[in-house]
Interface confidence: medium
C-alpha cells in the first residue's frame, strides 16, 4: 500500500521552472492542490538534477515565513504558525486545521551551495467540506482509470517486493530493532556515516524539536514512528532532538 501511495504522489509531482539559467537543478513540487477545510495537507518539494548541497530550506506563504529547515541547526517553525504547522515528512511541511484563509501560494526556497537559491511554488486551495465532496464526484471516473492502472503496477511491485523481502526479512528486522532500541532509550540517533557539512541530513529520528523538554512523554513513540518512516526512505531535516 505504501508503494502505491508513493507512486500516486510521484505522479502528481510538477516541475517548477528556475530563476537562473546557470543552475542545473529542478524543483519538483506537488503543484496545484486542494484540501478540505479543517483537514491537513502535506506540502512537498524535491530538488533534483544537481549535485549542490542543500544548506537550508525555507517554507513561505506569500511573504510570510512558515518554517526553516537548516542542515545544521534543525527545524524552526514560525511562532505564529506553531500550533498549525508540523515539520516533515522529510523537508516537507504539514499544514493542519486548514481554513479558507490558507488558500494561496506557498513557496519552498532551497538554499544550496554552490548553485544558490531554487524556488518551488505550490498553490493550495482550501475548500468547504461540501465543495470538496462535490468536486470529488467528478473525479471518480478518472480515479477509477488511474486506480486500474495502479493496481496492475502495484501487483507487480508487491510480487517483486515480497520475493525480495523473503531474502532480506532477517536483516531488515535487525535494522528496525536497532532503531527502536535507540529511540526507546531517548538517545539522539545520528547517521552511522555522517552526512557532509552543509547537507540536509537524510536519516534521522523524530523531527527536531518535537521531542523537546516540554514534549517528553511522547518522545519514544515519535522516535519509533519516524525511524520506521526514515527507513522507508523519507528523509528529515536534522537529527537534532532535545533530550536535555
Amino acid at each position: 500500500m505504501r508503494w502505491c501511495l508513493l507512486l500516486i504522489w510521484a505522479q502528481g509531482l510538477r516541475q517548477a521552472p528556475l530563476a537562473s539559467g546557470m543552475m542545473t537543478g529542478t524543483i519538483e513540487t506537488t503543484g496545484n492542490i486542494s484540501a478540505e477545510k479543517g483537514g491537513s495537507i502535506i506540502l512537498q518539494c524535491h530538488l533534483s538534477s544537481t549535485t549542490a548541497q542543500v544548506t537550508q530550506v525555507n517554507w513561505e506563504q506569500q511573504d510570510q515565513l512558515l518554517a526553516i529547515c537548516n542542515a545544521d541547526l534543525g527545524w524552526h517553525i514560525s511562532p505564529s504558525f506553531k500550533d498549525r504547522v508540523a515539520p516533515g515528512p522529510g523537508l516537507g511541511l504539514t499544514l493542519q486545521s486548514l481554513t479558507v484563509n490558507d488558500t494561496g501560494e506557498y513557496f519552498c526556497i532551497y538554499h544550496t551551495y554552490p548553485d544558490g537559491t531554487y524556488t518551488g511554488r505550490i498553490f493550495l486551495e482550501v475548500l468547504e467540506s461540501s465543495v470538496a465532496e462535490h468536486g470529488a464526484r467528478f473525479q471518480i471516473p478518472l480515479l477509477g482509470a488511474m486506480a486500474a492502472t495502479l493496481v496492475v503496477i502495484c501487483t507487480a511491485v508487491i510480487v517483486v517486493v515480497a520475493l525480495t523481502r523473503k531474502k532480506k526479512a532477517l536483516r531488515i528486522h535487525s535494522v528496525e530493532g536497532d532503531l527502536r532500541r535507540k529511540s526507546a532509550g531517548q538517545e539522539e540517533w545520528s547517521p552511522s556515516a555522517p552526512s557532509p557539512p552543509g547537507s540536509c541530513v537524510q536519516a534521522e529520528a523524530a523531527p527536531a524539536g518535537l521531542c523537546g523538554e516540554q514534549r517528553g512523554e511522547d518522545c519514544a513513540e515519535l522516535h519509533d514512528y519516524f525511524n520506521v518512516l526514515s527507513y522507508r526512505s523519507l528523509g528529515n531535516c536534522s537529527f537534532f532532538t532535545e533530550t536535555g
Partner: antibody, heavy 119, light 106 residues
C-alpha cells in the same frame, strides 16, 4: 545537568593565536550545535560562528572568516575556538553556547573566557 | 543584514516600578529572543520567541511584539532584575544581538 566549562583567561600579544576550549557534560555532545559568541568590554554580544558537533560542519560570521577556526574533540566532549592574527580589538570575553533546536536560541552558556591582547 | 536596535540604552528605575524595554529590527522579522546578563556572568536565556518565558523565569516578565517592534516588560521590578537585557535574532545565515538595555537602580 547540562554544563559548559571553558578554559581560563589568556593574555596574548598582537599577531599571536589563542585557542579556547569548552567542555560539555550532562547531554549527548554530538547531538547539538555549539556556537561561539564574544563580548568586548562595554560592547554588544557578537556571534563568531557555530560547529555542528555531529559532522564538524561549520558556519562563520563573515567578519571572522579566515581568522576563526572551530573544532571539536568528540571523545573529550570538548569544542574549541581558535582565533589567529590577534589584534587589540579582539580583547573580549569569549563564550561557547549550546543551540536549542526548534527555538533557534542558545539555551546553555559557558562561563566565558577573557582573552586580553596586549603588547 | 538585519540590525537590532534596543532602546533605551539605560533605564533608571526603582524597585516596584514597571520597566519597558524595546527591540527594533531594521526590517520585519519573525521573532526575537531575550537574554539577561549580570556583571561578570554569561548571558542567560530569558524569553524565547517573543513571549515564552524560559524555565524558572518569574511571571512578572512578559514579552510581546511583531514585525519590526518587540518589547520586554517587567511589571514590578525586583532587586534581582537589575541587569542588562539583550534581544537576539537568527536571520540566515547570521545571528545578531541588540546592543543591550541596562536596567539600573535609580
Amino acid at each position: 545537568q547540562v554544563q559548559l566549562v571553558q578554559s581560563g583567561a589568556e593574555v596574548k600579544k598582537p599577531g599571536a593565536s589563542v585557542k579556547v576550549s569548552c567542555k560539555a557534560s550532562g547531554y549527548t555532545f554530538t547531538s547539538y550545535v555549539m556556537h561561539w559568541v564574544r563580548q568586548a568590554p562595554g560592547q554588544r554580544l557578537e556571534w563568531i560562528g557555530y560547529i555542528n558537533l555531529n559532522n564538524d560542519g561549520t558556519k562563520y560570521n563573515e567578519k571572522f572568516k579566515g581568522r576563526a577556526t572551530l573544532t571539536s574533540d568528540k571523545s573529550a566532549s570538548t569544542a574549541y575556538m581558535e582565533l589567529s592574527s590577534l589584534r587589540s580589538e579582539d580583547t573580549a570575553v569569549y563564550y561557547c553556547a549550546r543551540w536549542r533546536v526548534y527555538y533557534y536560541a542558545m539555551d546553555y552558556w559557558g562561563q566565558g573566557t577573557l582573552v586580553t591582547v596586549s603588547s | 543584514e538585519i540590525v537590532l536596535t534596543q532602546s533605551p540604552a539605560t533605564l533608571s528605575l526603582s524597585p516596584g516600578e514597571r520597566a519597558t524595554l524595546s527591540c527594533n529590527a531594521s526590517s520585519s522579522v519573525d521573532y526575537v529572543h531575550w537574554y539577561q546578563q549580570k556583571p561578570g556572568q554569561a548571558p542567560r536565556p530569558w524569553i524565547y520567541e517573543i513571549s515564552k518565558l524560559a524555565s524558572g523565569i518569574p511571571a512578572r516578565f512578559s514579552g510581546s511584539g511583531s514585525g519590526t517592534s518587540y518589547t520586554l516588560t517587567i511589571s514590578s521590578l525586583e532587586p534581582e532584575d537589575f541587569a542588562v537585557y539583550y534581544c537576539q535574532l537568527w536571520n540566515y545565515p547570521l545571528i545578531t544581538f541588540g546592543q543591550g538595555t541596562k536596567v539600573e537602580i535609580k
